[in-house]
């Protein structure tokens, strides 16, 4: 039988807003990844910032509802925004436990679907809600 969905939880320092209220944090100790049990969905998300071929995780946690993409078994990120010149935010949604721990691959920043120069711009740390 299914369990309540459990996702990796992470919020980079300086990120504005929190998705902590979308679940209940499990007491996992220090060495293990932080885990959150989703309250309102069966869907995890992840956001990575790709700058000069280096991907840095910005946020991981529970989505506030089940929506397209949540049926995915794995985290397959797609480009969403350019928070600053030379960096691209990639987000994924997926619907298995801890599926947001890692991404399967990141498409190149210039691939189809990437917002162009007219796409949304934001200061670092303010881009997250656009991505969600």
């Amino acid at each position: 039988p299914p369990n309540r969905r459990t996702c990796v939880f992470f919020e980079a320092p300086g990120v504005r807003g929190s998705t902590k209220t979308l679940g209940e944090l499990l007491d996992t100790g220090t060495e293990l990844p932080r885990a959150i049990r989703c309250l309102y969905s069966r869907c995890c998300f992840g956001i990575w910032n790709l700058t000069q071929d280096r991907a840095q995780v910005e946020m991981q946690g529970c989505r506030d509802s089940d929506e397209p993409g949540c049926e995915s078994l794995h985290c397959d990120p797609s480009p969403r925004a350019h928070p600053s010149p030379g960096s691209t935010l990639f987000t994924c949604s997926c619907g298995t436990d801890f599926c947001n721990a890692n991404y399967s691959h990141l498409p190149p920043p210039g691939s189809p679907g990437t917002p162009g120069s007219q796409g949304p711009q934001a200061a670092p740390g303010e881009s997250i809600w656009m991505a969600l």
Partner: antibody, heavy 113, light 112 residues
């Protein structure tokens, strides 16, 4: 087919520890939570906690924190539960389950001096 | 902790007759994701528990269709349309909506 095979019965003295195993086969071990359940003699069932083998994250019934430790060995698809500081009221059958759908045969732990 | 109250605690039934077991929870078992994490198990004498029903009404693979789960919120029922000899044992309801997960005290079904 899915199988969970647990280790044999144990007789232990009060204050001692015991570690039991639960070997899984017939499915991808890292994709399902392993839960542990206690059944005291002639009593009902009590949920102890669960562990996700892929990353070792566990979730406990507060009552069993400090009493039970859950671990896994991914290389052998085996889950373990260690019970420490055993008392007579820890005498019970302990079951492992694959996310509650398939169950092991149980391990009888008898705490007696 | 969420208390799961089963009734009756003992259920003598004639073979071929229907049987019904009630389970009430002290809090609603509908979770924020819309799913109700309510399950039913049968423990035959000398055996491990066996999953019958999950998500209130979904039969687990291999479970005969004479087992029917229903209910919502705090009130749940397991019905057996025609009791067979192999149905003897203790039936437990279980909730995985709230931590800690909890079982009912069990209902012992026996043949009259």
């Amino acid at each position: 087919q899915v199988q969970l095979v647990q280790s044999g019965a144990e007789v232990v003295k009060p204050g001692a520890s015991v570690k039991m195993s639960c070997k899984a086969s017939g499915y991808t071990f890292t994709d399902y939570w392993v839960s542990w359940v206690k059944q005291s003699p002639g009593q009902g069932l009590e949920w102890i906690g669960e562990i996700y083998p892929k990353n070792g994250v566990s979730n406990f019934n507060e009552k069993f924190k400090g009493k039970a430790t859950l671990t896994v060995d991914k290389s052998t698809s085996t889950a373990y539960m260690e019970l420490r500081r055993l008392r007579s009221d820890d005498t019970a059958v302990f079951y492992c389950t694959r996310q509650r759908d398939y169950w092991g045969q149980g391990v009888l732990v008898t705490v007696s001096s | 902790d969420v208390v799961m109250t089963q009734s009756p605690l003992s259920l003598p039934v004639t073979l071929g007759q229907p049987a019904s077991i009630s389970c009430r929870s002290s809090q609603s078992l509908e979770y924020g994701d819309g799913y109700t994490y309510l399950e039913w198990y049968l423990q035959r004498p000398g055996q491990s528990p066996r999953l019958l029903i999950y998500g209130v009404s979904n039969r687990f693979s291999g479970v005969p269709d004479r087992f029917i789960g229903s209910g919502s919120g705090t009130d749940f029922t397991l019905k057996i349309s025609r009791v067979e000899a192999e149905d003897v044992g203790v039936y437990y309801c279980f909730q995985a909506t709230h931590d800690p997960n909890t079982f009912g005290a069990g209902t012992k079904l026996e043949i009259k």
